[in-house]
């Protein structure tokens, strides 16, 4: 059960990352031309 | 949606004293090193100064041809970036872009001329 | 300071043809945080610069997939694998991992 719930837990924050990321992976909070 | 507006631009003779200015939507400007780029026929694109974060003590830096005669700064809180240009040159003439890289706006055009 | 070396100045191209551009820096722009801070920007004529490239590789949004960025280090190359009018214009390089260097531009015109 305890590993169930860890894989879901690891599944939904995967899910949240590449919502916030896009699929183009370019974080829009974060700068990509140079490192800020 | 990105915007970067820039003004100030215009004439002014040799050794003259012009003040560009620039503002910024659509993306988190706190978050980004500005720069300012100027670009001329003669040099094509040019970097000419940039700004850090207040993380980074809004550290700034600049390019040889303009040290000790231009200077940077930021408002986050006006989300804008501001060019102060002392004793102006000829070879300063040019468009002037406020940007991060990632993103551009239209440009203000400056004229060093008498 | 950062020299970048655009190769060639001028390419006369065919529409429906690939194109391709190198850039080269006089130094390694792989930064300490091993990411390497390399940008391709179009000028098209009348118009301000807009970014195409970052990361070497990565294509902002809206840019068509006939566009690939490559090479690592000091060795950089913008290739189109089809010309379409919309991509005529200036294509400059731009480092960013010591400040900002841009390369001399090359031209994209028809033949």
């Known amino acids: 059960m305890k590993r169930f719930l860890f894989l879901l837990l690891t599944i939904s924050l995967l899910v949240m990352v590449q919502i916030q990321t896009g699929l183009s992976g370019q974080n829009d909070t974060s700068q990509t031309s140079s490192p800020s | 949606e990105v915007q970067l507006e820039e003004s100030g631009g215009g004439l002014v003779q040799p050794g003259g004293s012009m003040k560009l200015s620039c503002v910024a939507s659509?993306?988190?400007?706190?978050?980004?090193?500005m720069n300012w780029v100027r670009q001329s026929p003669e040099k094509g694109l040019e970097w000419v100064a940039q700004?850090?974060?207040?993380?980074?003590?809004?550290?700034?830096h600049y390019a040889e041809s303009v040290k000790g005669r231009f200077t940077i700064a930021r408002d986050d809180s006006k989300s804008s970036v501001y060019l102060q240009m002392n004793n102006l040159r000829a070879e300063d003439t040019g468009i002037y872009y406020c940007t991060p890289i990632d993103y551009w706006g239209q440009g203000t055009t400056l004229t060093v001329s008498s | 300071d950062i020299v970048m070396t655009q190769t060639p100045l001028t390419l006369s191209v065919t529409i429906g043809q690939p194109a391709s551009i190198s850039c080269k820096s006089s130094?390694?722009?792989?930064?300490?945080?091993?990411?390497?801070?390399l940008n391709w920007v179009l000028q098209r004529p009348g118009q301000s610069p807009k970014r195409l490239i970052y990361?070497?590789?990565k294509l902002d949004s809206g840019v068509p997939d006939r566009f690939t960025g490559s090479g690592s280090g000091t060795d950089f190359t913008l290739k189109i694998s089809r010309v379409e009018a919309e991509d005529l214009g200036v294509y400059y390089c731009v480092q960013g991992s010591h400040f900002h260097t841009f390369g001399a531009g090359t031209k994209l015109e028809l033949k």
């Open positions: 700004i850090r974060l207040k993380s980074n003590n809004y550290a700034t």
């Open positions: 659509g993306f988190p400007f706190s978050n980004y090193w």
């Open positions: 130094q390694s722009l792989l930064y300490s945080n091993g990411k390497t801070y």
């Open positions: 990361l070497v590789s």
